[in-house]
């Protein structure tokens, strides 16, 4: 029969022959022959291969370097890489999470729209009319102005995006 030019899924072509790939978590030690199957060997500790493969070396698990603010979110296995995340108050600088930066704070006049996670930074939004923020914070949302009316008071000083309104007593009309 004609030697194959393409192989089935989970196979690879070598020496005009289709050989089985090694399963995830194992590396190749010997290609198959006409008389023998592919020989594989599990990856060692701190190594992995995450696909059906013909690799002769396993990949090293990612190291979550605490000096870069990283910690292990999910320990790697022989089939999966380690997943790193950042320490509390920090977030990854990229999708690969190779280093961390401090969460940004929202300045006065801005509130937190979305609190930062280990992989995303704080999202700030300007405080709309009727709301204010007078602090620099990575957690505080914009607060609504105080409602003077509900306290039977009147606005003595208008609020801004950075300050609350100032309420005062109503002027009594003398008879």
């Amino acid at each position: 029969p004609e030697p194959p030019t393409a192989c089935r899924e989970k196979q690879y072509l070598i020496n005009s022959q289709c050989c089985s790939l090694c399963q995830p978590g194992q590396k190749l030690v010997s290609d198959c022959t006409e008389f023998t199957e592919t020989e594989c060997l599990p990856c060692g500790e701190s190594e992995f291969l995450d696909t059906w493969n013909r690799e002769t070396h396993c990949h090293q698990h990612k190291y979550c370097d605490p000096n870069l603010g990283l910690r292990v979110q999910q320990k790697g296995t022989s089939e999966t890489d380690t997943i790193c995340t950042c320490e509390e108050g920090w977030h990854c600088t990229s999708e690969a999470c190779e280093s961390c930066v401090l969460h940004r704070s929202c300045s006065p006049g801005f509130g937190v729209k979305q609190i930062a996670t280990g992989v995303s930074d704080t999202i700030c939004e300007p405080c709309p009319v009727g709301f204010f923020s007078n602090v620099s914070s990575a957690f505080e949302k914009c607060h609504p102005w105080t409602s003077c009316e509900t306290k039977d008071l009147v606005v003595q000083q208008a609020g801004t995006n950075k300050t609350d309104v100032v309420c005062g007593p109503q002027d009594r009309l003398r008879a």
Partner: antibody, heavy 121, light 113 residues
Framework: QVQLQESGPGLVKPSETLSLTCTVS????????LHWIRQPPGKGLEWIGV???????DYNPSLKSRVTISKDTSKNQVSLKLSSVTAADTAVYYC???????????????WGQGTLVTVSS | DIVMTQSPDSLAVSLGERATINCKSS????????????LAWYQQKPGQPPKLLIY???TRESGVPDRFSGSGSGTDFTLTISSLQAEDVAVYYC?????????FGQGTKLEIK
């Protein structure tokens, strides 16, 4: 039937190179890998390394800088070389056939009788 | 390297009685993708090379009597001889065949009481 026979000098001087040969019959070295294992007198087993049937090798990291395993398929022979030997390398040296059981499973299913190598001046 | 530790170091059992040898590995020998445990057992009689008894924790090599059985998973394994015979006197070694460097336990010497 499957047979393995280790051969080589029984006495090696310190700092010299230990050279052993494993001659096999009843199977082909292109079909099966071959391991070297040693056993100091009265002690346990230590894996030295393997030459897989495809010709690539894996060594014990504790010996890697000193060990070389190679094969001559046409002569059905595998050689072990261990350099810069000391008294701590005195042991019975075994060669053993690798058997592959699928799913990444390997074991040593046939062993030679072993040869005692003494390192002494 | 994976460290293999056997217990006890030596064992004396009466003929016809059950003998149990334990083996512990420093890391799991269970491959999560195929759920196989990569542990083998060898028997070495005085003046002889080791002989393969069991691989993949519990699969007996052909020709090995069924009184020999293996069990365990992860890091804890056991070799059991259900009814000890005189010819079973030997040193028994566990060995991880998970990954290189392949490593052996220190051995358990089995004698007749």
């Amino acid at each position: 039937q499957v047979q393995l026979q280790e051969s080589g000098p029984g006495l090696v001087k310190p700092s010299e190179t230990l050279s052993l040969t494993c001659t096999v019959s009843g199977f082909s070295l292109t079909t099966y890998g071959l391991h070297w294992i040693r056993q100091p007198p009265g002690k346990g087993l230590e894996w030295i390394g393997v030459i897989w049937r495809g010709g690539n090798t894996d060594y014990n990291p504790s010996l890697k800088s000193r060990v070389t395993i190679s094969k001559d398929t046409s002569k059905n022979q595998v050689s072990l070389k261990l350099s810069s030997v000391t008294a701590a390398d005195t042991a019975v040296y075994y060669c053993a056939k690798n058997s592959y059981y699928g799913q990444g499973g390997h074991a040593m299913d046939y062993w030679g009788q072993g040869t005692l190598v003494t390192v002494s001046s | 390297d994976i460290v293999m530790t056997q217990s006890p170091d030596s064992l004396a059992v009466s003929l016809g009685e059950r003998a149990t040898i334990n083996c512990k590995s420093s890391q799991s020998l269970l491959h999560s993708f195929n759920q196989k445990n990569y542990l083998a057992w060898y028997q070495q009689k005085p003046g002889q090379p080791p002989k393969l008894l069991i691989y993949f924790t519990s699969t007996r090599e052909s020709g090995v009597p069924d009184r020999f059985s293996g069990s365990g998973s992860g890091t804890d394994f056991t070799l059991t001889i259900s009814s000890l015979q005189a010819e079973d006197v030997a040193v028994y070694y566990c060995q991880q065949h998970y990954t290189t460097p392949f490593t052996f336990g220190q051995g358990t010497k089995l004698e007749i009481k």
